[in-house]
């Protein structure tokens, strides 16, 4: 191990230097260590499983964005191995506070049974 | 240029022993993780050997786990399967195939050497 | 092991049709599902790795789909050149394991 080395970088024995990780292509994340200094000899990348995607690099794949089940939101584009589900307008019986801050989430929509009286997607 | 080529088959009695190569050429055979697959006579493939590119990790499948070994020669370009306690059921081609590199699974095949077993 | 089935065995079609080869693991292998096509010299080539991937130099004419457990390879328009048997194999546990294969005749 060579603690000169960066957290994606490994010792190449034969030229002696640090030398960067092999990244992963989009849809897939590392498999076996490489870091450090070290780099495992069947360090590799694996496909993202389904219901996660990476942009690749050295991220792991993470699961994709639970627009109904989380948001309560249509959705809008379905994520693949590539890339997260993009979330649409609400479910039925739901509405989106406009004027509330994104939190870590972004939107989030809310059940019409709280919103203000008059609410343009509740009415009806 | 043929990139992977076997040699070694032949017949072979049960029992005896027999040690297969695969000559690797046009590309770099350290960088690579290397496998040894074989097809019994109207049979599907099977996966029997697996040797990293710098042999720190070895696997081999049940069927011939303890009887076979994979080894390789990283200087002389060259994949090795030495077969002892040969038996009828390892009547078949045998394929050398590379592990492409970080990924998990067979990219390139050699044309097969085939072993038969018998008295 | 992980069982890889390819219920058809051998299949029948024309030129120019689409054709659907299926596979299935006897649990998720999390795309780690591989395409392999070997001709009746004994040829053998990779065609789709994880899924949906095409292999380099190979025809957009294949394609794969599926995840879990259910996998499939579609040739969308049958060339003669297409009749070989094709395995599919699961990298996901070890031992790396492969369906029986299909084989693809011209009718």
């Known amino acids: 191990e060579d603690s000169n080395c960066g957290e994606n970088e490994y010792h190449n024995q034969t030229t002696g230097l640090c030398q960067q990780c092999p990244p992963c292509r989009p849809g897939e994340e590392p498999y076996m260590s490489c870091g450090y200094g070290t780099k495992d000899d069947d360090y590799g990348c694996v496909p993202c499983p389904a219901e996660k995607f990476s942009k690749g690099g050295y991220q792991i794949c993470r699961r994709h964005k639970d627009c109904e089940g989380f948001f309560r939101a249509t959705v809008l584009t379905p994520g693949d191995m590539e890339n997260d589900a993009e979330c649409g307008p609400c479910l039925p019986g739901y509405y989106m506070l406009e004027n509330r801050p994104r939190n870590i989430y972004g939107m989030v929509c809310y059940s019409c049974l709280l919103a203000p009286p008059n609410t343009k997607e509740c009415v009806g | 240029e043929v990139p992977l080529e076997e040699s070694g088959g032949g017949l072979v009695k049960p029992g005896g022993s027999r040690k297969l190569s695969c000559a690797a050429s046009?590309?770099?055979?350290?960088?690579?993780?290397m496998h040894w697959v074989r097809q019994a006579p109207e049979k599907g493939l099977e996966w029997i050997a697996y040797i990293s590119s710098g042999s720190s990790n070895v696997y081999y499948s049940d069927t011939v786990k303890g009887r076979f070994t994979i080894s390789r020669d990283n200087a002389k370009n060259t994949l090795f399967l030495q077969m002892t306690s040969l038996r009828s059921e390892d009547t078949a081609m045998y394929y050398c195939?590379?592990?492409?590199?970080?990924?998990?699974?067979?990219?390139?095949w050699g044309a097969g050497t085939t072993v038969t077993v018998s008295s | 092991d992980i069982q890889m089935t390819q219920t058809t065995s051998s299949l029948s079609a024309s030129l120019g049709d689409r054709v659907t080869i299926s596979c299935r693991a006897s649990q998720d292998i999390g795309n780690h599902l591989n395409w392999y096509q070997q001709k009746p010299d004994g040829t053998v080539k990779l065609l789709i790795y994880y899924t949906s991937r095409i292999h380099s130099g190979v025809p957009s004419r294949f394609s794969g789909s599926g995840s879990g457990t259910d996998y499939s390879l579609t040739i969308s328009n049958l060339e003669q050149e297409d009749i070989a048997t094709y395995f599919c194999q699961q990298g996901n546990t070890l031992p790396w394991t492969f369906g029986g294969g299909t084989k693809l005749e011209i009718k």
């Open positions: 046009g590309f770099t055979f350290s960088d690579h993780g």
């Open positions: 195939a590379r592990r492409e590199l970080l990924r998990f699974y067979f990219d390139v």
